[in-house]
């Protein structure tokens, strides 16, 4: 009976740091800590109410984190950046859709660079580094009334607590504002050894 | 000795729901249940023997689940849909390849919308919602004898038992029927808190 | 106290093969083994110092595994191939960027097939099988001074110890040599039942 009860606390959560927990405190502390340390994740969808204009590369700062498909756990979204709260190896991904319909008006140029850059910023060393990029040059001629293009990138990266992930795109005014179209996210896969 | 033996059952499977298991029944039940509750996954590859003929958006219902790279575990494939058997957060992905060779005949139009939509349907609320979309408008002119284009989408979503995942595409008759070309899948990453 | 200590060893590592460990040896062995068996992963970035020429399909053999974003753990990189050391189900991914600037000279043809193939080779059966492919035919006309295109593929596969993953591309001389542009990787998600 006693063994079973103790095991319930320990084994109940898949991702606890049991060794540390059991040395540092009581079984109750362990249970609390195991909950806090559940694997972090985020899936952020574009908030199109505040999309920058222009065709240059801009950082997208408006994302939803708690409506529709958007969600976050054990990570923080602040000032347009996804902040890591827990060291680990994470799979990062982004899906970015661009579209143009002739009813939106004429494009300034028919030759476009439609690009995404997923970047990491460290607070300690305040510089930004691109983790992943993708995209395409496109010729969106007036012969077609509608144009569409999507980019997907993904990769596995070591992230430290406090580091920030952000997304930059070119031609932000062409972004598709649907939650199924333009989003990015992360989920922790494993601890750092 | 006794403790060790009991632990073998409990810890042996990484993904057991130990708390529930230990309250509900014996160690033997726990071992059985731990096997049943192993992390679900699926990788489904296109079955091109029954591709719809239109150019409009259609749901693809013919997929392989047990040949070549295709496989499924703790999920169900039925009526063209991937059914979730275990609540959790899943990474979903799809790779869709379209191709055309001049020997296949003349395209009805050279301006194509090549798109994929990964959708979720809930039995309780019988409506379909698009989780992810991707694709591109393409101009596949007769100047080139061969055309090819691939789409990849992926994202992290909360799925409940009984929910169904399906894939819709435009221009299904242009799909590349190879198992390495057109597929979709899912794997569970973590439980819902 | 004794129970707690034993539990520390067992539960401390999320990904141990506890049953095997406890049968085969002492608690100390178990702790060591748990470290060795931590979930494998790799993220390899292109080493552009040795890119093949030509426009045909070639295997890319030069990748970084320990600089910048590149890293590897419990997998081996040898002779241009990523070697699996631990049976399991893995998520595999690749991101391949192609680019051309007019300052690089004229393209031999403006009609290009820009493709990636992620392949698996088994030492026991020395044949190569394509797990994933993606890409696009492109018309990179001289009207534009710069062209760019990226491909992303990903999927979930059963891999056995000793199997090798490699990446083939067409038009390798057009590859973008940046570490954020051209890379591939894998991470283990779960054991084989």
């Amino acid at each position: 009976g006693a063994v079973q009860k103790e095991l319930q606390h320990i084994v109940g959560s898949q991702h606890i740091r049991a060794e540390k927990a059991m040395v540092d405190g009581s079984w109750l502390d362990l249970a609390k800590r195991s909950k806090l340390e559940a694997q972090p994740f985020a899936h952020l969808t574009i908030n199109a109410t505040d999309i920058p204009t222009g065709s240059h590369k801009v950082s997208l700062s408006s994302w939803y984190h708690d409506r529709g498909w958007a969600k976050i756990s054990n990570m923080t979204f602040s000032n347009g950046k996804l902040i890591v709260n827990q060291d680990g190896f994470y799979y990062l991904y982004a899906n970015i859709c661009f579209r143009h319909h002739e009813t939106s008006g004429d494009l300034a140029t028919e030759y476009l660079q439609l690009m995404v850059y997923v970047t990491k910023t460290s607070i300690k060393i305040p510089s930004s580094h691109t983790l992943m990029k993708g995209g395409s040059t496109k010729y969106w001629s007036g012969n077609s009334e509608f144009h569409f293009y999507s980019i997907n990138v993904g990769g596995f990266f070591k992230l430290r607590s406090g580091e920030e992930i952000s997304v930059e795109v070119s031609n932000p005014s062409l972004l598709d504002p649907d939650q199924d179209a333009t989003y990015f996210g992360a989920f922790k896969v494993r601890d750092i050894d | 000795g006794a403790v060790q033996k009991e632990l073998q059952h409990i810890v042996g499977s990484q993904h057991i729901r130990a708390e529930k298991a230990m309250v509900d029944g014996s160690w033997l039940d726990l071992a059985k249940r731990s096997k049943l509750e192993a992390q679900p996954f699926a990788h489904l590859t296109i079955n091109a023997t029954d591709i719809p003929t239109g150019s409009h958006k259609v749901s693809l219902s013919s997929w392989y689940h047990d040949r070549g790279w295709a496989k499924i575990s703790n999920m169900t494939f039925s009526n063209g849909k991937l059914i979730v058997n275990q609540d959790g957060f899943y990474y979903l992905y799809a790779n869709i390849c379209f191709r055309h060779h001049e020997t296949s005949g003349d395209l009805a139009t050279e301006y194509l919308q090549l798109m994929v939509y990964v959708t979720k349907t809930s039995i309780k609320i019988p409506s379909s919602h698009t989780l992810m979309k991707g694709g591109s408008t393409k101009y596949w002119s007769g100047n080139s004898e061969f055309h090819f284009y691939s789409i990849n989408v992926g994202g992290f979503f909360k799925l409940r038992s009984g929910e169904e995942i399906s894939v819709e595409v435009s221009n299904p008759s242009l799909l590349d029927p190879d198992q390495d070309a057109t597929y979709f899948g899912a794997f569970k990453v973590r439980d819902i808190d | 106290g004794a129970v707690q200590k034993e539990l520390q060893h067992i539960v401390g590592s999320q990904h141990i093969r506890a049953e095997k460990a406890m049968v085969d040896g002492s608690w100390l062995d178990l702790a060591k083994r748990s470290k060795l068996e931590a979930q494998p992963f790799a993220h390899l970035t292109i080493n552009a110092t040795d890119i093949p020429t030509g426009s045909h399909k070639v295997s890319l053999s030069s990748w970084y595994h320990d600089r910048g974003w590149a890293k590897i753990s419990n997998m081996t990189f040898s002779n241009g191939k990523l070697i699996v050391n631990q049976d399991g189900f893995y998520y595999l991914y690749a991101n391949i960027c192609f680019r051309h600037h007019e300052t690089s000279g004229d393209l031999a043809t403006e009609y290009l097939q820009l493709m990636v193939y992620v392949t698996k080779t088994s030492i026991k059966i020395p044949s190569s099988h394509t797990l994933m492919k993606g890409g696009s035919t492109k018309y990179w006309s001289g009207n534009s001074e710069f062209h760019f295109y990226s491909i992303n593929v990903g999927g979930f596969f059963k891999l056995r110890s000793g199997e090798e993953i490699s990446v083939e591309v067409s038009n390798p001389s057009l590859l973008d040599p940046d570490q954020d542009a051209t890379y591939f990787g894998a991470f283990k998600v779960r054991d084989i039942d």
Epitope: - | G54, S55, V58, A108, T109, N171, S173, L174 | -
Partner: antibody, heavy 121, light 107 residues
């Protein structure tokens, strides 16, 4: 069920115009190319015109080129044939027919309407 | 323009007979050929497309073969419902042409 229903036929004098309609139901109209085929009394079948699923491409038989116009309204699931400068040899039963493939030409016509009669005299 | 020549123009046969109708194209059309059945006062019905593919719902006694310039429609065992006129139809370069038809009548 899948159905095509033609209307708009009738008797018309040479040189005049007529517009035929074809109402589609039971399938995704916007996903398929559509044809007009005619059959003069006691004669064989003659292909008249075709339009792609999105309306971007239209092709005509030499015998009607410049006089007939094929069009479609996907929001109304309706196909049209505007016939101008009608001649006596245009007298026929006019069928609308669905292309078997929406993406490719050449796969045949798998659904046909019952036809509407046009008499030019 | 590519011409389509069907033969024979009329064919008399009995129930249970094996019937073959031929269609010749004046130029190579690959396998872009379809076969239709039409009964008096009715719309045509697609039987075969791409020279040899059987349309859904069509009885398996109907089959098509050939490529290039010579094509055949075969009815392996003629049934009472099969007495009708049969048309071949070719596709080539955004143009469709029907053959003149073959009438299959009761002997």
């Amino acid at each position: 069920q899948v159905q095509l229903v033609e209307s708009g036929g009738g008797v018309v004098q040479p040189g005049r115009s007529l517009r035929l309609s074809c109402a589609a139901s039971g399938f995704t109209f916007s996903g398929y190319g559509m044809h007009w085929v005619r059959q003069a009394p006691g004669k064989g079948l003659e292909w008249v015109a075709v339009i792609s699923y999105d309306g971007t491409n239209k092709y005509y038989a030499d015998s009607v080129k410049g006089r007939f116009t094929i069009s479609r309204d996907n929001s109304k699931n309706t196909l049209y044939l505007q016939m101008n400068s009608l001649r006596a040899e245009d007298t026929a039963v006019y069928y609308c027919a669905k292309s078997l493939s929406g993406t490719y030409w050449g796969y045949g016509m798998d659904v046909w309407g019952q036809g509407t009669t046009v008499t030019v005299s | 323009d590519i011409q389509m020549t069907q033969s024979p123009s009329t064919l008399s046969a009995s129930v249970g007979d094996r019937v073959t109708i031929t269609c010749r194209a004046s130029q190579n059309i690959g396998n872009w050929l379809a076969w239709y059945q039409q009964k008096p006062g009715k719309a045509p019905k697609l039987l075969i497309y791409k020279a040899s593919s059987l349309e859904s719902g069509v009885p398996s006694r109907f089959s098509g073969s050939g490529s290039g310039t010579e094509f055949t429609l075969t009815i392996s065992s003629l049934q009472p419902d099969d007495f009708a006129t049969y048309y071949c139809q070719r596709y080539n370069s955004y143009s469709w042409t029907f053959g003149q038809g073959t009438k299959v009548e009761i002997k």
